[in-house]
Structure formats: structure tokens, C-alpha cells
């Protein structure tokens, strides 16, 4: 049911990475706006993005208050210039959103090599631990904040003269690997989360070679 | 139901070449790493290379490398090991796995197998 | 490459006994060491992940351990099902690599 100059909002979507949470929506409106509510399972409605045209919401500062809880979303729509309207029986028209729980569904972002460094045989690649939206005592979590041992990484790297990638893991953000002396090599790193079963590995980072600036050298 | 399915073996001739095929289903091969693993009859197990199917990174032991290519479908959802250049010493039941971490090569499930034999 | 070294090839022990299987790792390898189970005509199951933690479904009389680079294997009680040939394999580099296997026989 509802009014016959709106229509619900259908193929709604989470779109989430590190935790940037956002939820999208068709169709673009013609002659009406949306609303957005959110809750856990177990809470009260909350209203966002109050009657837009957009078709989209940022739900970011709501779950990153407890990225462990389930989310539901719900969008409502309204004809435009006349947001009182409601359906026939009683209520506006909405949709609801898949649910969502941050914590296992978020994406990984594309993770960054911060430096590596090479003593002899022995090369320390680092991670950048990457900041999210996530706050605890008014300060912002890193990745690892969050994740702590469920995140691990994975380190490629590969002879610049050769195409076989060899691999190491971590679950800190560093790694120490042995290298053949005199040559070059070059790495990509990816964030996994093992225990997840979809949503597991991030992007690759992008490549870093040595004989490139983030390199530092140091011959023992 | 999380499985690996191996086909493709058979008989061949040294020199030869052969296809083995891993179809998974029950998961996204491009969420984890596929790794080939071979046992020659009645010896132990010998890693044979991998791939991450998200990047389409490889890397293979020596034993095969430049003969052998591990390539994937991920619109298939499956992973393939081609062979060239056969030799006896080839002969092996060929499993694929799926790894449990990234990359590392710790293994949680694995296809039932399909014997390669090359052989004049 | 690092080379696993297992022992024994091959023991005979009785339903009940306590069953020790070792690896040593040629070089540090950390707690990335698996074990596997692999029964005749079979693919090869995991028992034992990172050295001492044991895979989703298989029995509590399955452990692992690690001290250095030693890595060890224990069956508490051993029961009919467990007569197998049993591998450590490091996963701590590429490539990974197998120990030559443990043939676990009925005495």
C-alpha cells in the first residue's frame, strides 16, 4: 500500500569499508524524498538523512558505536512538499535494508606499505595501520585496534627479475623476510581476516620496490 | 557444503601435456588461495604451487616451474593446473586445497584427488 | 627451502596407547607448523593448525605442541580410526614443505 505518487525504495545496499558505512538505495526520486532509520536488533529506531533526494545515507556514526552489533535499516518514503502523507494504512511507505553487522561484513580497505628496510639478508616491511571511524575514549581505532588478532596480513614479494611471488603472513604489521643479497625486490601486501568466510581479503596494496623512496638500505 | 573437485588425469606420454581441473563450490575461490599438492605412489606429499585467484599471483616449486601454470576462473569458480613437458617422475595423484589463512599453505579442505601417469 | 624432518617413518602401538610424533624444522619457523591425517586411497585432513591449535571437528585426543623448532604431535589414547600416516608440514615460507610422513601401525 501507500500514496500513488510514491514508491518504495527497493535494492537496498550496505556499502562498507573500514567500518565508512553507507547505505544505497534506488530509484532516484521523481516527486518524492526519503528518510533513514536504523536500529540494532534489540534498540529503538534512530532517524537519518531526513527527507532527501539523495539516495544514499552515511550510517557510519551509528555503527561504529558497537561494529559487533547487527544492523537493520529502514527507508521511507515521502511525496515531496507534502511530508505528512502517509499510506493508506496509516504509515509511510519503506523497505528494509538487509541486515548488516559491521564487524564481519565490513570491506577490507586497500592497505599501504608505510616503509621497508633492509639489513644483509633480512628486509622489515611495515604496514601503515590504517585509521577508521571507530572511537573509544574520544580517540579513533586503528584497524588493528579493532581487529587485533583476527587481522593478519599477507606479504607478496617477488625478485624484480622474476614472476613467482613468494609470501609471508603476519598478524602484527610487520614482517622480517630473507632476501638473496644484491638483488631487487619488490612487494604488495593484502589485509585477510581468516575467520570470515566472505568479505576476507582486502585490495592488494600497491607494489613498492627497492631502489624506490620508502626503501632505506643499510648493508651490515 | 564447502568442496573441491579434481578432473582432468589420465595417461600420458612424456613430453606430453595434461589439464587437471578444481572446481570448487560451497565458496568464492577469489576469498581464499588455491594450492596443487601432489604424491607420487606410495611416497609423501609434495607441495606443488599456488594461486591467489584475486590478484592471479603464483608461485611454484622448482621441480615444476616453467612447466608447469596454475591459472583460475573465477567467474567458474574453479582453479586449473596445466602440465607440459611431462615426465615420469610426474606420476602423482594431484590434489588442489584450499587454504585455511591467506597464502601460507595450511590446508582445511582438499579435493579426493586424480592420478597423473606418464608413461611410454 | 625448509626441510622437515620427521620421526618416526613408521611405529606399531595398540588401541589405547599414547602416540608421540615429532618434526624438527631446519630453521625458525614460528608456530606455522600443521598437521595432517591421510588414510589409504584418501586425501590427507587437518588435525593440528599453528603448531597447537586443533581443527574444527577433530577429536580431543589430538594435540600438538612446539618447543623451538621442534614440533610434536600427540595422540592420547589411540583408537582404531587413528591407524594412518600422519604429516607436519611449515607454512611459515614459500614454499611450504612436508615432513616425510609417519606410517601409525596396529601391533
Known amino acids: 500500500s501507500g500514496t500513488t505518487n510514491t514508491v518504495a525504495a527497493y535494492n537496498l545496499t550496505w556499502k562498507s569499508t573500514n567500518f565508512k558505512t553507507i547505505l544505497e538505495w534506488e530509484p532516484k526520486p521523481v516527486n518524492q524524498v526519503y528518510t533513514v532509520q536504523i536500529s540494532t536488533k534489540s534498540g529503538d529506531w534512530k532517524s537519518k538523512c531526513f527527507y532527501t533526494t539523495d539516495t544514499e545515507c552515511d550510517l557510519t556514526d551509528e555503527i561504529v558505536k558497537d561494529v559487533k552489533q547487527t544492523y537493520l535499516a529502514r527507508v521511507f518514503s515521502y511525496p515531496a512538499g507534502n511530508v505528512e502523507s502517509t499510506g493508506s494504512a496509516g504509515e509511510p511507505l519503506y523497505e528494509n535494508s538487509p541486515e548488516f553487522t559491521p564487524y564481519l561484513e565490513t570491506n577490507l580497505g586497500q592497505p599501504t606499505i608505510q616503509s621497508f628496510e633492509q639489513v644483509g639478508t633480512k628486509v622489515n616491511v611495515t604496514v601503515e595501520d590504517e585509521r577508521t571511524l571507530v572511537r573509544r575514549n574520544n580517540t579513533f581505532l586503528s584497524l588493528r585496534d579493532v581487529f587485533g588478532k583476527d587481522l593478519i596480513y599477507t606479504l607478496y614479494y617477488w625478485k624484480s627479475s622474476s614472476s613467482g611471488k613468494k609470501t609471508a603472513k603476519t598478524n602484527t604489521n610487520e614482517f622480517l623476510i630473507d632476501v638473496d643479497k644484491g638483488e631487487n625486490y619488490c612487494f604488495s601486501v593484502q589485509a585477510v581476516i581468516p575467520s570470515r568466510t566472505v568479505n576476507r581479503k582486502s585490495t592488494d596494496s600497491p607494489v613498492e620496490c627497492m631502489g624506490q623512496e620508502k626503501g632505506e638500505f643499510r648493508e651490515i | 557444503e564447502v568442496q573441491l573437485v579434481e578432473s582432468g588425469g589420465g595417461l600420458v606420454q612424456p613430453g606430453g601435456s595434461l589439464r587437471l581441473s578444481c572446481a570448487a563450490s560451497g565458496f568464492t575461490i577469489s576469498d581464499y588461495t588455491i594450492h596443487w599438492v601432489r604424491q607420487a605412489p606410495g611416497k609423501g606429499l609434495e607441495w606443488v604451487g599456488y594461486i591467489d585467484p584475486s590478484n592471479g599471483y603464483t608461485y611454484y616449486a622448482d621441480s615444476v616451474k616453467g612447466r608447469f601454470t596454475i591459472s583460475a576462473d573465477t567467474s567458474k569458480n574453479t582453479a586449473y593446473l596445466q602440465m607440459n613437458s611431462l615426465r615420469a617422475e610426474d606420476t602423482a595423484v594431484y590434489y588442489c586445497?584450499?587454504?585455511?589463512?591467506?597464502?601460507?599453505?595450511?590446508?582445511?579442505?582438499w579435493g579426493q584427488g586424480t592420478l597423473v601417469t606418464v608413461s611410454s | 627451502d625448509i626441510q622437515m624432518t620427521q620421526s618416526p617413518s613408521s611405529l606399531s602401538a595398540s588401541v589405547g596407547d599414547r602416540v608421540t610424533i615429532t618434526c624438527r624444522a631446519s630453521?625458525?619457523?614460528?608456530?606455522?607448523v600443521a598437521w595432517y591425517q591421510q588414510k589409504p586411497g584418501k586425501a590427507p585432513k587437518l588435525l593440528i593448525y599453528?603448531?597447537?591449535f586443533l581443527y574444527s571437528g577433530v577429536p580431543s585426543r589430538f594435540s600438538g605442541s612446539r618447543s623451538g623448532t621442534d614440533f610434536t604431535l600427540t595422540i592420547s589414547s589411540l583408537q582404531p580410526e587413528d591407524f594412518a600416516t600422519y604429516y607436519c608440514q611449515q607454512h611459515y615460507t614459500t614454499p611450504p614443505t612436508f615432513g616425510q610422513g609417519t606410517k601409525v601401525e596396529i601391533k
Open positions: 630453521q625458525d619457523v614460528n608456530t606455522a
Open positions: 586445497a584450499r587454504d585455511i589463512q591467506s597464502v601460507s599453505g595450511e590446508f582445511d579442505y
Open positions: 599453528s603448531a597447537s
